[in-house]
């Protein structure tokens, strides 16, 4: 007889799950020598454990402790670049500029990264049919309490002047409901973090507006000043350029507006 | 509750070396679970880092400090340590201990957990 199983609004978990998340980690292991100390079978078993055999509505950062405990990972705390949007350019920033680190540059943002995972209640099973979406189902759901855990902890780490990588695209260019909006600007530390500096993304070749006036831009200059934390923008009215000019800055084309 | 509390001179004379220690309580400073570090607050000035300690031993310092700082932790005691030497009058500023959570992604500032601060005046 079929055991009935809970039908959820989001996609279920990715398929091979297990083994990408642990050959994630072994590559991710032998890339970076600082992390080559870590366990990479005791990396999944923290993962697993942090969902399997639990309600998928029902998960708490605590049930993430011990894979954050195992992730553990320095970045540089001024080297710090968040992103709301647009995480191809700001990953495709980061490869180019490697001193600077986005969440996905780290170890628990680099296993995550654009999966799906989660289980069923008293069960050891994957749920691979379905899993619970964020605004139709619940917010408790296994992705969602992972990235609000490690996009805390990955704001609670920046000091000096963060960067966040802005889609001047998108209707709401800053958005209180995004994981940078709801989670990352309140836990930028005031006592730590002198400057957030906003790079907007222009989409269009012949757009020259200044997208720093935006209204949601000033929304975001707003809550960032009552923290106590400086605030600037700029305008990147030709991405492509600039990435081109962060990999050779020497270009005479590199110093007029980007 | 990791509790910290540093103790030293208040009053240090130019050209010589600050020391400061700091007592750890509810935690162990040997324990991998923490990382350890100490702050600065110079009169009207913004906080900042002089540097922390890794569990294993690995240091950082702030770039502009390095050569005159040293961070050491003492097990026995459950105590870590600054020396800050060839002080000038622009090195008086309230010190503190910190102590950050390993658990995810860590800056090399630690701020879950910070001492009352101790005022180090340098003057003659």
């Known amino acids: 007889v079929p055991r009935w199983r809970q039908q959820w609004s989001g996609p279920g978990t990715t398929k091979r799950f297990p083994e990408t998340v642990l050959a994630r980690c072994v590559k991710y292991t032998e890339i970076h020598p600082e992390m080559r100390h870590v366990d990479c079978q005791s990396v999944w078993d923290a993962f697993k454990g942090a969902f399997i055999s639990k309600h998928p509505c029902n998960i708490t950062e605590e049930d993430y402790q011990p894979l954050m405990k195992l992730g553990t990972q320095t970045v540089p705390c001024n080297k710090i670049l968040l992103w709301s949007r647009i995480k191809d350019l700001a990953h495709q920033f980061t490869q180019v500029q490697r001193d600077m680190f986005t969440l996905e540059d780290t170890l628990l943002g680099y296993l995550a990264d654009d999966l799906t995972w989660c289980g069923e209640f008293n069960t050891s099973k994957i749920n691979y049919q379905s899993c619970p979406d964020w605004r139709k189902d619940c917010s408790n759901n296994p992705v969602s309490v992972f990235w609000k855990t490690v996009s805390r902890r990955f704001a609670e780490a920046a000091c000096d002047v963060v960067h966040v990588m802005l889609n001047g695209s998108r209707s709401k260019i800053f958005d209180k409901n995004s994981t940078f909006g709801s989670v990352e600007v309140h836990n930028l530390q005031p006592e730590k973090v002198q400057t957030l500096e906003a790079w907007v993304i222009h989409g269009g070749r012949e757009d020259s507006r200044d997208l720093c006036q935006d209204p949601t831009i000033k929304e975001l200059e707003s809550i960032i000043s009552k923290r106590n934390i400086q605030f600037s923008c700029k305008n990147i009215y030709r991405p492509d350029k600039f990435l081109q000019c962060v990999k050779n800055p020497e270009d005479s084309s590199c110093t007029s507006e980007i | 509750q990791l509790q910290l509390q540093e103790s030293g001179p208040g009053l240090v004379k130019p050209s010589e070396t600050l020391s400061l220690t700091c007592t750890v309580s509810?935690?162990?400073?040997?324990?991998?679970?923490?990382?350890w570090g100490w702050i600065r607050q110079p009169p009207g000035k913004r906080l900042e880092l002089i540097g922390s300690?890794?569990?294993?031993?690995?240091?950082y310092f702030n770039p502009s400090l390095k050569s005159r700082v040293t961070i050491s932790v003492d097990t026995s005691k459950n105590q870590f340590s600054l020396k800050l030497s060839s002080v000038t009058a622009a090195d008086t500023a309230v010190y503190y201990c910190?102590?950050?959570?390993?658990?995810?992604?860590?800056?090399?500032?630690?701020?879950?957990?910070r001492g009352q601060g101790t005022l180090v005046t340098v003057s003659s």
């Open positions: 910190a102590g950050g959570d390993t658990y995810g992604p860590v800056g090399q500032w630690p701020s879950d957990y």
């Open positions: 509810g935690g162990s400073v040997s324990s991998s679970s923490y990382y």
């Open positions: 300690i890794y569990y294993g031993g690995s240091t």
